[in-house]
Amino acid sequence: MSDSKCDSQFYSVQVADSTFTVLKRYQQLKPIGSGAQGIVCAAFDTVLGINVAVKKLSRPFQNQTHAKRAYRELVLLKCVNHKNIISLLNVFTPQKTLEEFQDVYLVMELMDANLCQVIHMELDHERMSYLLYQMLCGIKHLHSAGIIHRDLKPSNIVVKSDCTLKILDFGLARTACTNFMMTPYVVTRYYRAPEVILGMGYKENVDIWSVGCIMGELVKGCVIFQGTDHIDQWNKVIEQLGTPSAEFMKKLQPTVRNYVENRPKYPGIKFEELFPDWIFPSESERDKIKTSQARDLLSKMLVIDPDKRISVDEALRHPYITVWYDPAEAEAPPPQIYDAQLEEREHAIEEWKELIYKEVMDWEERSKNGVVKDQPSDAAVSSNATPSQSSSINDISSMSTEQTLASDTDSSLDASTGPLEGCR
């Protein structure tokens, strides 16, 4: 910790039920969301002249789940630099020593809305395919670093009015256990792949299932597999897609297999019926072709058996998506994760506190020495914007949405105030 840190650098402001003690450069804090990890505020960065999201992690070392997630998020946000993954602009703690250490503040790009709000808009094929393309680029970039998300959902994907998209978080740690028979905790499972729900092994295309669910929701305007718990989630999947083959059943653990095999047998519904023509945009003949391509992509992503499901690379080359293909985006060099043990780390709480503190200090040291870039490569709001000029901070603060935090509350936005104005 640098000796230069002093109280005069910070000020405190009450936000909902929490006190934000932030660097004075961040002004006009307005709450925009809250979730499992903490509260998020929109703010104006007076140094960069841009609007940002400030996320407070309160006592991130309070338990193993919080600690592991906070540490993992810090490490990955530092390493990952891709236009479809949210950028970390700053990290700080107002506490002066490790003994006093309580809170971490993450400053990130601020976007206009999350996908929950876009779902209620009627998107044309151009916008929809571009959003999906960006999702796939971001996912592919994470995969190239060995990060398999497993928990993609609309609330963790954010967009700007120019149709640009970013993934907010890094999903479930590799060590996070998911068990079909486990207690139904309050989390959104609608987008989790069968292999996650059923506690099977998984590979990269586990994330393709989630993209398929999100795409289906963008098309239909509602959640496509809305289960009340893991078991009901599985029921909703098989009711629509049909009971999987015996070949798939063999891959299940005995107890899960026993349950799954004893469910009623469903033949499944044809994709032409699940996603009929009339729910797609149909302004022109070209739209009809695009509708058929979109449905084909859905049918290849929403496949229960991961061994038969399309891969990320195949999805990027699918006719519906490939029109946007740019090697600089889809084949960006993989990030170098400096902590080789990141996914396997297990520690005493005291050790987590020290590790997280070191990460924060490392950032502060690097930024003090000018190593950390001042301006994001793809800033959320143009750097010459002021709060009055920017639509983001004004529009977003009035929405019940969450820009930089995993949230399980789906919020809607009237299509007339839609966050997607233009496309690339």
């Epitope: 070392f61 338990n63 193993q64 003994e99 297990e346 005493a348 709480i349 050790e351 506190k353 020290e354």
Partner: antibody, heavy 119, light 107 residues
């Protein structure tokens, strides 16, 4: 061979102080988080305090907070527990235990040192 | 604080028996659950960590299962040296807490 050897226990009057030590050998002491766990006569185990590998981060059970201080000297491979304002209910065998690397569990324990608080 | 409740508090069994001890946490602790064995006058010994992983050197007749709030320690075929007191312990958050113990006695 991993060894943890506690010392410093004994009879002390209520309100008195005592400093326990735990000498570690057979492993890289500075790489491991450590803890103190106690056991009152005929009772179960109670975690007392923990400390990170570098010693910067500590935590305590509510029952000892403000009275006990955990510390370590990595150059001496030694863990300490400074116990002040001792009470009769602090009477116990005090064990020093190492947190494993693979998982946060106490994988090695010392043989314990008895602290008796009585007038 | 997370409370750990073990049952039964004592148990009589014979050599060769299959024995099960349960431990319940007052809130979800994922798989941050460890089991220890303690014999009179001795320090505790780690048997199972992470709910189901067998500590090196511990006989395979010991096994653990569970996640969330409910956990089980099973001894498949009781041996004379297994008569002792067993404790569960959570390392999910501080203060780390132990169950009150289960004393396993010879019938």
């Amino acid at each position: 061979e991993v060894q943890l050897l506690e010392s410093g226990g004994g009879l002390v009057q209520p309100g008195g102080s005592l400093r326990l030590s735990c000498a570690a050998s057979g492993f890289t002491f500075s790489s491991y988080a450590m803890s103190w766990v106690r056991q009152a006569p005929g009772k179960g185990l109670e975690w007392v305090s923990g400390i990170s590998s570098y010693g910067g981060s500590t935590s305590y059970a509510d029952s000892v907070k403000g009275r006990f201080t955990i510390s370590r000297d990595n150059s001496k491979n030694t863990l300490y527990l400074q116990m002040n304002s001792l009470r009769a209910e602090d009477t116990a065998v005090y064990y020093c235990a190492r947190f494993g690397h693979a998982f946060p569990a106490f994988d090695y324990w010392g043989q314990g040192t008895l602290v008796t608080v009585s007038s | 604080d997370i409370q750990m409740t073990q049952s039964p508090s004592s148990l009589s069994a014979s050599v060769g028996d299959r024995v099960t001890i349960t431990c319940r946490a007052s809130q979800s602790i994922s798989s941050y659950l460890n089991w220890y064995q303690q014999k009179p006058g001795k320090a505790p010994k780690l048997l199972i960590y992470a709910a189901s992983s067998l500590q090196s050197g511990v006989p395979s007749r010991f096994s653990g299962s569970g996640s969330g709030t409910d956990f089980t320690l099973t001894i498949s075929s009781l041996q004379p040296e297994d008569f002792a007191t067993y404790y569960c312990q959570q390392s999910y958050s501080t203060p780390y807490t132990f169950g009150q113990g289960t004393k396993l006695e010879i019938k």
